[in-house]
Interface confidence: low
């Protein structure tokens, strides 16, 4: 039933300053929520290029309401980079979710509808902690 | 996972500061992340992240909720995790006085083209 197809809402959450100061690393979290059915492919793009290193994505989407057969789903992913890379304001981070709104097999056979395909993205820009030094700034630029 | 250093951090939405998620990270592989008993709180399974360029691996899980009383300090209460793993972020490190001071004392930066 194509009336039940819901594309995801996507948000990117910026690293905690506590993590940056404690570990010198920065984790961005991407959250895709409210989609049905559970056909999504999530990818991270940094400065326009897809990245795989430092990425971990949930092995499968989570039902938002486990008791419901046609519950909507959510999926999260993490991207971890060095603190200096995150603190370079020139660096652009994008979480892209490709959504395929496929319906069940028998419904496909009957209505022969095309899949509802959609790309939904959210983004963040690197953010200097304001009190940066030329050394940390240069490191961020060099590692970009 | 070498040198586990378990911590829970609160992350803010890049577009709206009133939304946040909780990140439980850097815990050892023996730690199990339990689902919440509250159906309005979502907790993911743990996954392993590999920062190949830094030869560094870490475990992590994420929790979030739309509930107004949801807090990162107790988001992972059903999991057996060490005390004091929640690291609250400072309000902001973008303090005008600090910024002025760093530009005063770092003359190299003053002459760099930041465009």
């Amino acid at each position: 039933d194509l009336n039940k197809v819901f594309p995801p809402e996507v948000a990117v959450f910026e690293p905690s300053e506590a993590e940056i100061s404690h570990t010198q690393k920065a984790t961005l979290v991407c959250l895709a929520t409210g989609f049905f059915p559970d056909h999504v492919e999530l990818s991270w793009w940094v400065n326009g290029k897809e990245v795989h290193s430092g990425v971990s994505t949930d092995p499968q989407p989570l039902k938002e309401q486990p008791a419901l057969n046609d519950s909507r789903y959510c999926l999260s992913s993490r991207l971890r980079v060095s603190a200096t890379f995150w603190q370079n304001p020139r660096n652009h981070f994008r979480c892209q979710v490709q959504f395929y709104g496929l319906s069940e097999n028998d419904e496909w056979t009957q209505d022969r509808a095309k899949p509802v395909t959609q790309i939904v993205s959210a983004e963040a820009w690197g953010r200097a902690d304001c009190g940066f030094t030329s050394v940390s700034y240069q490191q961020g630029v060099l590692s970009a | 996972i070498q040198n586990p250093d378990p911590a829970v951090y609160q992350l803010r939405d890049s577009k709206s500061s009133d939304k946040s998620v909780c990140l439980f990270t850097d815990f050892d592989s023996q730690t199990n992340v339990s689902q919440s008993k509250d159906s309005d709180v979502y907790i993911t399974d743990k996954t392993v992240l590999d920062m190949r360029s830094m030869d560094f691996k870490s475990n992590s899980a994420v929790a979030w909720s739309n509930k107004s009383d949801f807090a990162c300090a107790n988001a992972f209460n059903n999991s057996i995790i060490p005390e004091d793993t929640f690291f609250p972020s400072p309000e902001s490190s973008c303090d005008v006085k600090l910024v002025e001071k760093s530009f005063e004392t770092d003359t190299n930066l003053n002459f760099q083209n930041l465009s």
Epitope: P37, H39, L102 | -
Partner: nanobody, 117 residues
């Protein structure tokens, strides 16, 4: 898991024809859509044609009228008949399966098609 193996690529002259085959194995009951995609050197992978289990087809503009996608459900095969080939059709052609159950996305290793005189 679903495994996909393509065959049928090769060298063909402009205006010629070629038929690509893709054999699907494994958990094929999960598949909802099969498709052909192509990747030219230094470019992104682009959709060429897709077919659903209800036999609804979809084609890229560049493939309409020249290419035909079909499938043989009994043999778990999907085919791409390519006619009136042009040099710009030169690419690695990939078979892709979309599954109804996560993870939805499977790719074959690709087969090279070269259109040249």
């Amino acid at each position: 898991e679903v495994q996909l193996v393509e065959s049928g690529g090769g060298l063909v002259q402009p205006g010629g024809s070629l038929r690509l085959s893709c054999a699907a194995s494994g958990e094929v009951h999960k598949i909802n859509i099969l498709g052909w995609y192509r990747q030219c050197p230094g470019k992104e992978r682009d959709m060429v044609a897709t077919i659903t289990i209800g036999d609804a087809t979809d084609y890229a503009d560049s493939a309409k009228g020249r290419f035909t996608i079909s499938r043989d459900e009994a043999k778990n095969m999907v085919y791409l008949q390519m006619n009136s080939l042009k040099p710009e059709d030169t690419a690695v052609y990939f078979c892709r399966a979309l599954s109804r159950l996560y993870p939805y996305n499977y790719w074959g290793q690709g087969t090279l098609v070269t259109v040249s005189s």
